[in-house]
């Protein structure tokens, strides 16, 4: 909260290039999609062109685990990834530029957190900083939203549905059809992080199939219809 | 407003042990890393101790390393300092204070003295 | 360890410039800050990040840092200004506090 921040006035000219990092306070996305956390820094090396490495944590500083790293080489801009935690984690920003700005995809609840960025020189000018003040990132919940409905062809002449939806808690999908009991077991498929697939294996009758996605934020719905062309008697 | 607390302050004798604590009104304890810093009488400051917002990374001054732990309660808002084996030069007074995002301290406590004396 | 070194004191005549120095190795690479504090009262942060100034503290405050060598100036010395000075910095994990200037207005 910045109730209890102080607020600040320049009181000289610019000052001589210290360690510093600036990250903000919060940053705020919804599951499923992709966040970036800003973050650059100043250093006192001028012109320092020798290896580096930068480095993004999360929990602790100094000590949490790394979920990305990176190393460019001696006068390189290319930061060469050495980890990302599940690929979901990318270098936006060029540390050669002063900025360690990292993206992080398809996000999930979990990935709630604080998120610390470090930067170590490792040539002749051998030093190290990283923020103590990490950025929050807070990721919200997604009400469900359906991506893919589809009615494929399966064995001997039948057909089967597929229904994809993600959310954040992963929603529950049932499908729903002509069959007697107006409702037919969906065989659900494996999730994928937000995402969720339900497979509805045998369409026996002809008419609108439903897909229904629900979790504690709503519900959505979306229908094929099968029509299958019977020849003339 | 932004307050900081301190408590647990008095008279004890070398060897013996003392809890202090800070308690914290006014904005997001949680949000914040704390510290502990001392004044012992007609010196200057000292820092002593800092502690992560969770609690889970901690620093200390050599001159209280293995004898002085810092802890804190997020649920209460309230930041403490363990002394344990405490000797006559550890007198003093003790301030918890706020770091703010440079690496400094924005907002101070009004102080609890320390006396330790046989 | 990292260490910061102030004078003693330093006394200036109301209305006039006090300038307080603080220098260390730190300093070339770290940022500064500055805290006043007055007899049995606790410190207050007067600069931060070398020469920023918090809300609340008064324009004649400021700061600089040049070379290993930070420096607090107080434009217009008050009588209110009395009180001791710290400056204070910070090695990436441990943070240090120099001796302490005691700043004396004449008069």
């Known amino acids: 909260d910045a109730s209890g921040d102080l607020l600040n006035t320049e009181a000289h000219s610019a000052p001589a290039q210290r360690w510093s990092m600036q990250v903000p306070a919060e940053v705020n996305a919804e599951a499923g999609d992709a966040a970036v956390l800003p973050c650059t820094f100043t250093h006192p090396h001028r012109h320092y062109d020798g290896p580096l490495t930068a480095i993004w944590r999360s929990g602790e500083p100094y000590a949490g685990p790394q979920v990305f790293r990176c190393t460019a080489a001696p006068g390189s801009e290319l930061c060469q990834t050495a980890l990302s935690l599940h690929g979901r984690f990318r270098l936006l920003g060029n540390p050669r530029r002063n900025d360690l700005s990292l993206r992080v995809e398809r996000l999930a609840l979990a990935d709630s957190g604080r998120y610390f960025c470090r930067v170590e020189f490792t040539g002749d000018a051998h030093d190290r900083y990283e923020s103590r003040h990490g950025v929050r990132l807070r990721v919200t919940a997604a009400a469900p939203r359906i991506v893919n409905i589809s009615v494929l062809p399966g064995p001997a002449h039948a057909f089967r549905a597929l229904c994809t939806a993600e959310g954040e808690p992963p929603p529950a999908l049932a499908w729903s059809g002509p069959a007697p009991g107006n409702s037919s077991a969906a065989l659900q498929g494996q999730g994928h992080g937000y995402q969720v697939t339900a497979e509805l294996p045998a369409l026996t009758r002809d008419g609108r199939y439903t897909c229904t996605a629900a979790n504690s934020l709503g519900r959505a719905e979306a229908s094929v219809y099968l029509f299958r062309f019977h020849g003339a008697p | 407003q932004v307050q900081l607390v301190e408590s647990g302050g008095g008279l004890v004798q070398p060897g013996g042990s003392l809890r202090l604590s800070c308690a914290a009104s006014?904005?997001?304890?949680?949000?914040?890393?704390m510290t502990w810093v001392r004044q012992a009488p007609g010196k200057g400051l000292e820092w002593v101790s800092f502690?992560?917002?969770?609690?889970?990374?901690?620093y200390y001054a050599d001159s209280v390393k293995g004898r002085f732990t810092i802890s804190r309660d997020n649920s209460k808002n309230t930041l403490y300092l363990q002394m344990n084996s405490l000797r006559a030069e550890d007198t003093a007074v003790y301030y918890c204070?706020?770091?703010?995002?440079?690496?400094?301290?924005?907002?101070w406590g009004q102080g609890t003295l320390v006396t330790v004396s046989s | 360890d990292i260490e910061l070194t102030q004078p003693p004191s330093v006394s200036v005549a109301p209305g006039q410039t006090a300038r307080i120095s603080c220098s260390g190795d730190?300093?070339?690479?770290?940022?500064a800050s500055w805290y006043q504090q007055k007899p049995g009262q606790a410190p207050v942060l007067v600069i931060y990040?070398?020469?920023k100034r918090p809300s609340g503290i008064p324009e004649r405050f400021s700061g600089s840092n040049s070379g290993n060598t930070a420096t607090l100036t107080i434009s217009g010395t008050q009588a209110e200004d009395e009180a001791d000075y710290y400056c204070?910095?910070?090695?990436?994990?441990?943070?240090?506090f120099g001796g302490g200037t005691k700043l004396t207005v004449l008069g």
């Open positions: 204070a706020r770091e703010g995002t440079s690496s400094m301290f924005d907002v």
């Open positions: 006014g904005f997001t304890f949680s949000n914040y890393w």
């Open positions: 502690i992560s917002y969770s609690g889970s990374t901690t």
């Open positions: 730190a300093l070339r690479s770290y940022y």
């Open positions: 990040d070398d020469n």
């Open positions: 204070g910095s910070y090695d990436g994990t441990v943070h240090v």
